[in-house]
Interface confidence: low
Amino acid sequence: ALPAKPENISCVYYYRKNLTCTWSPGKETSYTQYTVKRTYAFGEKHDNCTTNSSTSENRASCSFFLPRITIPDNYTIEVEAENGDGVIKSHMTYWRLENIAKTEPPKIFRVKPVLGIKRMIQIEWIKPELAPVSSDLKYTLRFRTVNSTSWMEVNFAKNRKDKNQTYNLTGLQPFTEYVIALRCAVKESKFWSDWSQEKMGMTEEEAPCGLELWRVLKPAEADGRRPVRLLWKKARGAPVLEKTLGYNIWYYPESNTNLTETMNTTNQQLELHLGGESFWVSMISYNSLGKSPVATLRIPAIQEKSFQCIEVMQACVAEDQLVVKWQSSALDVNTWMIEWFPDVDSEPTTLSWESVSQATNWTIQQDKLKPFWCYNISVYPMLHDKVGEPYSIQAYAKEGVPSEGPETKVENIGVKTVTITWKEIPKSERKGIICNYTIFYQAEGGKGFSKTVNSSILQYGLESLKRKTSYIVQVMASTSAGGTNGTSINFKTLSFSVFE
């Protein structure tokens, strides 16, 4: 049979290297030789390229080499397939060399901030060694911050006579390291170069861009003064590398601004001892380039009644995240402060906090929380300068099976009844929220029975037992990840009772 007609011819001019054409050969049953016929020099000249490989994958491609390739030019390319039964020709295809030229990537040799111009870096590069002198080049510049995985892209063109091979990338974050890569193509071409090697560059440092401020109110002391722990951190979206030399804090009673106290610190928290009335606290951070905008927080008076609006709250784990959702009765509240810390018996040292706006849910990546640790999560509604009553729940980012079972005791042994009691597993050993307890019991040599009760129950009465019989009993505590048995206990029912 005749060979299949070559289809899907595609050609690329690797600039100043070679012109390579490929095609789909079809299913060949016998040895087929391919000849690529081209006309060039605007139809004035013609020549052939013959595949000389016997491996089928290499036979579907053929290359023409320099020096007989120059831009600009128009080519016709036709592929002939020949076997013992005859020859078949492809359709004639037409190519403008400028449209299929592919260059080497450009070389970025410098990425630098421009002195005095904020949030910008200048990229300088060397055009590909091999690029048509007669054509303009188009470029795609892609960039990302060093700790991001998603690229942003910007496209631009350079005139061939433009000796200035630089691009000013603006609208960036201050004092942030960026990864830059560049590719180019002849303006008329559909083929882009490969990406250049990546180069790093950093935008100029600026004054700190702002602070978020929060507080932990503690009970009033004997003298009526109240300890308030002030907490702050860089505003969301602040550059990762942003440097701070220190913080200025000033505070005064709401009723009298003349009684302003000021202090400096380099820490990220501060304990104030305030009177029982309401106070305003303000602060700024500063570095060698200036001060941040002022962050302000109102501390309510001890007797002040805070508003309540959160009606229900729940936590669940979904797709590697802990999700906390709540419902509010106040439609005008759209900012919330979330606090979370591990539920340990000692005073919490690692309080974390974060604000949420325009949403009644909060998510945190599972890996930001310790697995098998119980967290106390509180949500505070915030309306203007007022902070409402928090709603608190406990949640685990990841649950495990308890590391020990409940400590169990047998009480009130009767002829046919017994009371099984157990203690709660210590917080540190639970590894999750205990959702139920299961009591397993079995007469010696008999069938086993079990009874499951909810997690609020810490004792259970077994009935309808056999008199004067040895039993083994065990209690299992379960989380959503599974259960762990406590130690097994043996007891023997009485042979008779005074009440019989």
């Epitope: 100043r16 290297k17 020096p67 040799f109 055009k127 060694e129 091999l130 002198v133 006579k161």
Partner: antibody
């Protein structure tokens, strides 16, 4: 650092050929175009042609088209300029000069020390 | 081919003088103009390219200006080491051509 070292002075008879070499070091030889420029005694500078060592591509001044051949040997990072059918007016100092790529292929950034070719019967 | 015309062909000046050399192209070469300095028995040295960009290590007293067809090299305050011959050259396309040169001599 970038350096171009040319071969020594030559004395040739009219009608003969001369081949001047230019050994490059301190950079990637195939990445930069090499130009040849000559200067007759007491005269100005005259561009003769160039070669792209990456692919051997050349471009010549029409005035020398038939007599000059510029070649490059990637393995030794050396460029050569051969001028044939010498006449007395070809007596000159011949320079190789590497382009400064980012400044365009025709800016002569680094020069060899020059080779004096004397054509005399 | 593009012709480059330099003037004057020579000039005499004293140390500290401001010196101006002009170069004219026979057609529009945009900003693709270079200036070279050559001292007797030495290879030329690139001073300026793209009409006004100083090459690496060139003293700031050398400056270039112009675009299109008319270009100028200025030495703001002539120093003893500046007495030499200066050439302009277009770097627009092949073939490259140079101006005839301007010899700067001591007055």
């Amino acid at each position: 650092q970038v350096q171009l070292v040319q071969s020594g002075a030559e004395v040739k008879k009219p009608g003969a050929s001369v081949k001047v070499s230019c050994k490059a070091s301190g950079y990637t030889f195939t990445g930069y175009i090499m130009n040849w420029v000559r200067q007759a005694p007491g005269q100005g500078l005259e561009w003769m042609g160039l070669i792209n060592p990456y692919n051997g591509g050349t471009s010549y001044n029409q005035q020398f088209q038939d007599r000059v051949t510029i070649t490059a040997d990637e393995s030794t990072s050396t460029a050569y300029m051969e001028l044939s059918s010498l006449r007395s007016e070809d007596t000159a100092v011949y320079y190789c000069a590497r382009d400064g790529y980012d400044d365009g292929p025709y800016t002569l950034e680094t020069w060899g020390q020059g080779t004096l070719v004397t054509v005399s019967s | 081919d593009i012709q480059m015309t330099q003037s004057p062909s020579s000039l005499s000046a004293s140390v500290g003088d401001r010196v101006t050399i002009t170069c004219q192209a026979s057609e529009d070469i945009y900003s693709f103009l270079a200036w070279y300095q050559q001292k007797p028995g030495k290879a030329p040295k690139l001073l300026i390219y793209n009409a006004q960009t100083e090459a690496q290590g060139v003293p700031s007293r050398f400056s270039g200006s112009g675009s299109g067809t008319d270009f100028t090299l200025t030495i703001s305050s002539l120093q003893p080491e500046d007495f030499a011959t200066y050439y302009c050259q277009h770097h627009y396309d092949s073939p490259l051509t140079f101006g005839g040169g301007t010899k700067v001599e001591i007055k």
